[in-house]
């Protein structure tokens, strides 16, 4: 995995200033979910990683931003709209929906730091919330009251 | 969320040293549902948050460490060994297992920084991988070949 060697300003800068500026503005994912182009993947395997054995199977899509920490995030993408039957592992069961589990993840964006007179003094990290989908979960549909 | 105002050492330290090594893994939900204290919670609700509507329902347990970033992590705990029937929402279906989705999450521990002569110069962040469970997923059991 990649890393940044330092979150600190350039050599010699007064490091007592607040380098991590914290805010809580959610940022949407860069790549919206696209329908899966491979219909044959809507099945629950009897082997392999958990995301392929799930009856709400999913794949991961890479989202890379070189000015963000983490630089690489992965968004889950559901392979089926409904859950796969436990019996067959292939047919869909319309009684269950395959839903994304979302999470607002804390990320840090690298921004230029500015000194007392507005001069550029290294980089600061700005905290943001960034929405990622972690997995697909088989749920009972909501009953509207 | 509390925060540390700076991830850098105290004034005057050479900040060109490598303070942070960053990895690229997702973080579990910030605001999970509170743990359900009732044993009848091994059921899939038709309402409420995703973790209670799932046929592999789970609760979250808080893990707080004030010398770690993030300070609060949440671990998913499965409420049923098997998946809940989509038909009834309560009876378990032994054809499916409720399995934890694990992730090695990058966290940072606050450690004292030491200057050239071993003097304490502020705090540095030490990167570690920390295993968290994100959710419970209904899967087909592995077939042993």
């Amino acid at each position: 995995y990649s890393h940044w060697p330092s979150c600190c300003p350039s050599k010699g800068q007064d490091t007592s200033e607040e380098l991590l500026r914290w805010s809580t503005v959610p940022v949407p994912p860069l790549e919206p979910a696209r329908p899966n182009r491979h219909p044959e993947s809507c099945r629950a395997s009897e082997d392999g990683p958990l995301n392929s054995r799930a009856i709400s199977p999913w794949r991961y899509e890479l989202d890379r931003d070189l000015n963000r920490l983490p630089q690489d995030l992965y968004h889950a993408r559901c392979l089926c709209p409904h859950c796969v039957s436990l019996q067959t592992g292939s047919h869909m069961d319309p009684r269950g929906n395959s839903e994304l589990l979302y999470h607002n993840q804390t990320v840090f964006y690298r921004r230029p730091c500015h000194g007392e007179k507005g001069t550029h003094k290294g980089y600061c990290l700005e905290r943001r919330l960034y929405r990622v989908s972690l997995a697909c979960v088989c749920v009972r549909p909501r009953v509207m009251g | 969320y509390s925060h540390w105002p700076s991830c850098c050492p105290s004034k005057g330290q050479d900040t060109s040293e490598e303070l942070l090594r960053w990895s690229t893994v997702p973080v579990p939900p910030l605001e999970p549902a509170r743990p359900n204290r009732h044993p009848e919670s091994c059921r899939a609700s038709e309402d409420g948050p995703l973790n209670s509507r799932a046929i592999s329902p789970w609760r979250y347990e808080l893990d707080r460490d004030l010398n770690r970033l993030p300070q609060d992590l949440y671990h998913a705990r499965c409420l049923c060994p098997h998946c809940v029937s989509l038909q009834t929402g309560s009876h378990m279906d032994p054809r499916g297992n409720s399995e934890l989705l694990y992730h090695n999450q990058t966290v940072f521990y606050r450690r004292p920084c030491h200057g050239e002569k071993g003097t304490h110069k502020g705090y540095c962040l030490e990167r570690r991988l920390y295993r968290v469970s994100l959710a419970c997923v209904c899967v087909r059991p592995r077939v042993m070949g």
Partner: antibody
Framework: EVQLVESGAEVKKPGASVKVSCKAS????????MNWVRQAPGQRLEWMGL????????SYNQNFKGRVTLTVDTSASTAYLELNSLRSEDTGVYYC???????????????WGQGTLVTVS | DIQMTQSPSSLSASVGDRVTITCSAS??????LNWYQQKPGKVPKLLIY???SLHSGVPSRFSGSGSGTDFTLTISSLQPEDVATYYC?????????FGQGTKLEIK
């Protein structure tokens, strides 16, 4: 010693599919993303996509309009490229290439397979 | 997609010459640029990463510079074994894109 060994040359009819394999050795397969790059005769290198063996995470070049599927078999330390709906312009050499990183500055393809020639005619 | 344009497309130089190849990006890519060398009939090899960092085992006669949209690969003293096609590649955004290549020959 890091090595990427690709499968042999293929000749395919238009409309068919091809699946190329790339067996890795000499490093931790799950620790590095794998890129796939195509070189048509006399043309520039063209990036097709990458896959992270750790979680199967992918990024595709949308210019291939969904015809590309990347997969891995971590137990065999092997990456696969599948290209379907083949046409004559898909003729070329297909390379797998490991993506290394050094710091936040660096994503680069440091080891390449020997290439697999795919001919569509 | 970010377009990468190299110039010249081909060049011929004598052993010992200083050779310069340029690469231009259609938009700013900071310093997120790699250079690859592909000898005739061979596989591409990483030469320089992050604009100016020499990959391990690459002779010091190779160097890179630039930032933003304009980049340069320089060979300070051309050697016979440097006959190859050289490609630049940006990695700030997906899809990664390569230049069309510069074919270098010995006079």
């Amino acid at each position: 010693e890091v090595q990427l060994v690709e499968s042999g040359a293929e000749v395919k009819k238009p409309g068919a599919s091809v699946k190329v394999s790339c067996k890795a050795s000499g490093y931790s397969f799950s620790g590095y993303t794998m890129n796939w790059v195509r070189q048509a005769p006399g043309q520039r290198l063209e990036w097709m996509g990458l896959i992270n063996p750790y979680n199967g995470g992918t990024s595709y070049n949308q210019n291939f309009k969904g015809r590309v599927t990347l997969t891995v078999d971590t137990s065999a330390s092997t990456a696969y490229l599948e290209l379907n709906s083949l046409r004559s312009e898909d003729t070329g050499v297909y390379y797998c290439a490991r993506e290394d990183f050094d710091s936040w500055t660096y994503f680069a393809m440091d080891y390449w397979g020997q290439g697999t020639l795919v001919t569509v005619s | 997609d970010i377009q990468m344009t190299q110039s010249p497309s081909s060049l011929s130089a004598s052993v010992g010459d200083r050779v310069t190849i340029t690469c231009s990006a259609s938009q700013g890519i900071n310093e997120y640029l790699n250079w690859y060398q592909q000898k005739p009939g061979k596989v591409p090899k990483l030469l320089i990463y992050y604009t100016s960092s020499l990959h391990s085992g690459v002779p010091s006669r190779f160097s890179g510079s630039g930032s933003g949209t304009d980049f340069t690969l320089t060979i300070s003293s051309l050697q016979p074994e440097d006959v190859a096609t050289y490609y630049c590649q940006q990695y700030i955004n997906f899809p990664y894109t390569f230049g069309q290549g510069t074919k270098l020959e010995i006079k």
